[in-house]
Amino acid sequence: APVPPGEDSKDVAAPHRQPLTSSERIDKQIRYILDGISALRKETCNKSNMCESSKEALAENNLNLPKMAEKDGCFQSGFNEETCLVKIITGLLEFEVYLEYLQNRFESSEEQARAVQMSTKVLIQFLQKKAKNLDAITTPDPTTNASLLTKLQAQNQWLQDMTTHLILRSFKEFLQSSLRALRQM
């Protein structure tokens, strides 16, 4: 698994470097997670032909994966820093159950899957420090998450492969949209 942000050799070799600002740390953290997703997608795509499926075909699924919409205030039209930040944190919290599902779904990239999960937890903490209106953030219900996890794990092999692919692609898209918005804050 790659080394977490702030612990790579370049950082060690340059102790005089200015410490990262909160925004830079968040930016680096998201890019680190995106690298992890990229590695996981490689394994998934090598293992099945899901990656060749059209977006339209994949859209026909029952997963309720978080997605950015116009009303979330993260796009240029209607951009709203506070609303957007709440959406990013809420979305990441909702993704956690799906990241838990990804554990044990990878053979050669098991560590990588764990790194993506743990790095996301750290990212949520960074973002919660940045948010002013923490009351607006709804945390998913643990019981609901537990039953969702059980349901996903009970699927047949083909559906599990499809689910894995969809989670990775949706999570990547959510992080990209989040970072685009965060870079405007």
Epitope: R31, L34, Q76, K172, Q176, R180, R183, Q184
Partner: nanobody, 124 residues
Framework: EVQLVESGGGLVQPGGSLKLSCTTS????????VGWFRQAPGKEREFVAD????????WYAESVLGRFTISRDDAKNTVYLEMNGLKPEDTAVYYC?????????????????WGQGTQVTVSS
């Protein structure tokens, strides 16, 4: 890194239009975010517009909002910048840049590959 080539620049009268293209032969260009920047003589390079890996996610500088449109055709490995209602102050060398993370943004540091630029001159 990907090799980027801009084209479509030229001389145009105020109020006129141009469509710039940014092309690469690199695979997986569809996964890159692409930004357009411009640099007028004696001025700093400035952000114009960008498009994420998801084509619906675009962002524009205030000065071009409503006049310029950024779009992508992943089948052709090309990103376009359609410029309407051109003004003399739009005169500059226009550069496209790519971000392998598919994110982009309004700062040069977010991009890891750059083209050589194409000249746009708006004059009567």
């Amino acid at each position: 890194e990907v090799q980027l080539v801009e084209s479509g620049g030229g001389l145009v009268q105020p109020g006129g239009s141009l469509k710039l293209s940014c092309t690469t032969s690199g695979r997986r260009f569809s996964e890159y975010a692409v930004g357009w920047f411009r640099q007028a003589p004696g001025k700093e390079r400035e952000f114009v517009a960008d498009i994420g890996e998801q084509a619906e996610n675009t962002w524009y500088a205030e000065s071009v909002l409503g006049r310029f449109t950024i779009s992508r055709d992943d089948a052709k490995n090309t990103v376009y910048l359609e410029m309407n209602g051109l003004k003399p102050e739009d005169t500059a060398v226009y550069y496209c840049a790519a971000d392998k993370y598919g994110v982009g943004g309004n700062a040069q540091g977010y991009y890891d590959s750059w083209g050589q630029g194409t000249q746009v001159t708006v004059s009567s």
